[in-house]
Amino acid sequence: ESLGTEQRVVGRAAEVPGPEPGQQEQLVFGSGDAVELSCPPPGGGPMGPTVWVKDGTGLVPSERVLVGPQRLQVLNASHEDSGAYSCRQRLTQRVLCHFSVRVTDAPSSGDDEDGE
């Protein structure tokens, strides 16, 4: 499933929105990492357009901010990308998923560096 700013022509929706999302997920990434967030819709069906919001501001897809169906990817993350992210139903602003993202200054260490 490719991410990017390409447009998706959407067909009819299968379901009406499901229940409210649970508590927010807390995620930590290293500087330079790609922040990847996934938010499958409740009930599994599309529910109209969605928007990713960071600290109250809607995110517009760009070369660094990639949006796919129910997915967000922020490339080459830095400390400024830390914050509260939510995936919302565009029409009602109903929160579908909630994430607390922290980007640490140090790059994340790979598994191959352990025990060397």
């Epitope: 998706r8 022509v9 929706a13 009406v16 357009p49 501001t57 565009r90 029409l91």
Partner: antibody
Framework: EVQLLESGGGLVQPGGSLRLSCAAS????????MSWVRQAPGKGLEWVSG????????YYADSVKGRFTISRDNSKNTLYLQMNSLRAEDTAVYYC??????????????WGQGTLVTVSS | QSVLTQPPSASGTPGQRVTISCSGS????????VSWYQQLPGTAPKLLIY???KRPSGVPDRFSGSKSGTSASLAISGLRSEDEADYYC???????????FGGGTKLTVL
Amino acid sequence: EVQLLESGGGLVQPGGSLRLSCAASGFTFSSYDMSWVRQAPGKGLEWVSGIYSGDGSIYYADSVKGRFTISRDNSKNTLYLQMNSLRAEDTAVYYCAKDGPMNEESRFDYWGQGTLVTVSS
Amino acid sequence: QSVLTQPPSASGTPGQRVTISCSGSSSNIGNNYVSWYQQLPGTAPKLLIYADSKRPSGVPDRFSGSKSGTSASLAISGLRSEDEADYYCASWDYSLSGYVFGGGTKLTVL
């Protein structure tokens, strides 16, 4: 001041094509969702298509699906509607409408003045 | 026939309060917000109410919106002659994956 200026309307024969443009100014065009809404003479409003910035999705009314294509050029602050295989029932004033901020509830908060499309032989 | 049902006409005298209804279903009004638009003769529509009951800046508080279940209403109090216009309700419809408008209500100020 937000301004939306439609152009490209006119008289076209059934089966023909037309491309409408909507030049936007007074706001950060790329950050806003946009729609086309039409109104046949003496009739009510009908939503035609919408293009959504937040997830890149595009939606169409059943009546135009497969015939009309919505697109945008953010570098030119312009919204387009490519209309193919036009029918008499597509005759209407076509309005370009701007949605509210992405982090607020959806609504058409600004409208252009409209451009008339007449499909007739 | 429109997905959202509005009375074709309504009327009132200056100073009166009039209400315009908009009836839908669970796939639109029942699970989504309603917005209302005013269209004066020969002009483009203008946003009056969004998110069921919110008023954009510049819209007089004589205009108010409400919703219950799958129906919504627009109320205009202190009716004025300049309120004579067509009024449309709108909502997203999940089963159609698109916006739907009511057929419109022509308001006459007697």
